[in-house]
Amino acid sequence: YSNFRKSVDSTGRRQYQVQNGPCSYTFLLPETDSCRSSSSPYMSNAVQRDAPLDYDDSVQRLQVLENILENNTQWLMKLENYIQDNMKKEMVEIQQNVVQNQTAVMIEIGTSLLNQTAAQTRKLTDVEAQVLNQTTRLELQLLQHSISTNKLEKQILDQTSEINKLQNKNSFLEQKVLDMEGKHSEQLQSMKEQKDELQVLVSKQSSVIDELEKKLVTATVNNSLLQKQQHDLMETVNSLLTMMSSPNSKSSVAIRKEEQTTFRDCAEIFKSGLTTSGIYTLTFPNSTEEIKAYCDMDVGGGGWTVIQHREDGSVDFQRTWKEYKEGFGSPLGEYWLGNEFVSQLTGQHRYVLKIQLKDWEGNEAHSLYDHFYLAGEESNYRIHLTGLTGTAGKISSISQPGSDFSTKDSDNDKCICKCSQMLSGGWWFDACGPSNLNGQYYPQKQNTNKFNGIKWYYWKGSGYSLKATTMMIRPADF
C-alpha cells in the first residue's frame, strides 16, 4: 500500500512523508517562516534604506547574510545530491510497483519542491542584490575615508613642520631670555646698591628739609610782621613829614611820595621789591576787603598768586558753595583762595594760569594757559581758558569751552548724576569731565582706581589720584 502525508513536527517545521509498502520517505523542507517579517529593514523583499548605517553594523549584517546564503546553498546541494542518489532507485521501484495515482503524488511533491526551491532562489537573488548594494556603499565610504585620511595626514605633516620651526624659534628666544636675565640681574644688583646709597642720602636730606621748613615758617611769620612794621613806619614818616611842612615855610621840604601799601596780586608785591615766597595780604580790587594768599616768588620768574594747593590731605575740600566763594584752608598748606576774589581779579586784567602737578613716582608736569578768567557768581564762576602749553597733556584736562563751578550743595554740571557729590570737591565739572584737582586726597599705594581722587586725565588717566597740585595766576604782561 501507499499513502502521502503532510504534517508539522514538534519544532514547527513542515515535513512531507511518503509511505510506500514497508518503506517510508520523509522530506524536511527549509523554513520560510524563519525569515524576518516584512516590518524588518532586512526583509529580503524590503526596499533598501538610504540612511547610512554605522560601519560596524554593516559589516555584521554582511556576515549574517553571507552565512544565510552559504547555508541555503549547502542545503540545496544536499537536496540535489539526495534526490540524485536516493530518488533514482526509489523512483524505479515506484514506477514498477505503484499505480498511476502514486505518480501524481510524486509529481505534487516534486512540484512543491520546485516551488520551494524557486522561492528560495528569488529570496537569495534579493539578498545578493542587497549585499551588492551595501558593499558598493561601503566601498564608497571607504574611499571617502581614505581621501579624508590623506588630507589629515598632509595637515599633520604641515603642522609637524610648523611645530619644529616654532621649537627652533622658542629655543632661540629662550636663550635670549636667559642672556637678558643675566644682564638684568647684574643691573638689578647695581640698582639695589644705588638705592641703598640714595636712601641714606634721602634720610640725610629729610632732616635738612625739616629744619629748612621750620626756618621757612619762622621767616614767613617774620616777613608778615616786617610788612606790618613797614606799613606802620611809612605812616609815621608821612605824618612827620606833614607836621614838618607848613604853608609859610620858605625852605621847601621834599615830600616823599607814599609807597604803595596795598596789593591786588603777588605780581605787584614782587615788583615792589618783596621777592621772597610766603604769605602776603592782598586787597580786593576797588575795595578795602583783604585776603591772605601764598605768593610764589621763585617759579618761572616769580610773582605768582597761588589760588589752590594740595599736598597732604590735611584739608577737607568737600565744601559748600559759600566756602568755595570765600576761600578756605591755610595759605601755608592746603587751601582754596576763593572764587569771588579770583573772579574780580581776573575780570580786570588779562591773567595766565599755571597748574603744577606731582605724581607718586616723583614725576612733575605742568599746564600753562595764556588767558584765564572766571565769570561772576551770577554765571556760576564759569571758567574761561585759552592757549594751552606744557607737559601735562596736549589736550586740556579742564573741559573746553568752560564749565560752571559746582559744589556739593550747588549742582551746575552737565551730568545726569551730581558730579560734585559723587566725585567729591568743588570744580568746573562737565559730565563729569577730565579733571578734578579738588577731589578726595589718597595717600601713596591707595591712589589708583580712585574715581573721586585728584585727577588730571591727560597726564595720568582717570583712576590715578595725584600727590600734589598747585594752581597759580599772574598778569599776562608780567
Epitope: 573741559s399 559730565a431 563729569c432 577730565p434 574715581f451 585727577k455 582717570s462
Partner: nanobody, 115 residues
Framework: EVQLVESGGGLVQPGGSLRLSCAAS????????MSWVRQAPGKGLEWVST????????GYADSVKGRFTISRDNSKNTLYLQMNSLRPEDTAVYYC????????WGQGTTVTVSS
Amino acid sequence: EVQLVESGGGLVQPGGSLRLSCAASGFTFSSYAMSWVRQAPGKGLEWVSTINSGGGRTGYADSVKGRFTISRDNSKNTLYLQMNSLRPEDTAVYYCNADHPQGYWGQGTTVTVSS
C-alpha cells in the same frame, strides 16, 4: 548726547545674586575701557571692577574678587556685572563709568542686600 543707563538693582537677601546692566549711547562704546564703581550710604566712591575695550582683560577690587564678574557686549553697547554671594556690605548705588576723558557717568542703580 552721551547716556549711560544702569539697571538691574533691587533688594536681595544675603547669598543671593543680581545682574546689573549698563546701556551706553552717544559715544564709541567699543573704544573705551568700562568700570563699575559703587557708593555706599554716607561713604565715598569705591572702585569695583574694570574691563578693557575688547573685553579680554578684567580687574576686580579685593572685596568682590571671586564673587562678581564683569563682562561687555560691544554689539549691544552694554556693560554687565554679575553679582553672586551678595553680602550686606555690598549695599550701595552702583554706577558704570567710561574711561573717557569726560569720565561719563550714569544715574546709578541701587542694590540693597538685607534679610
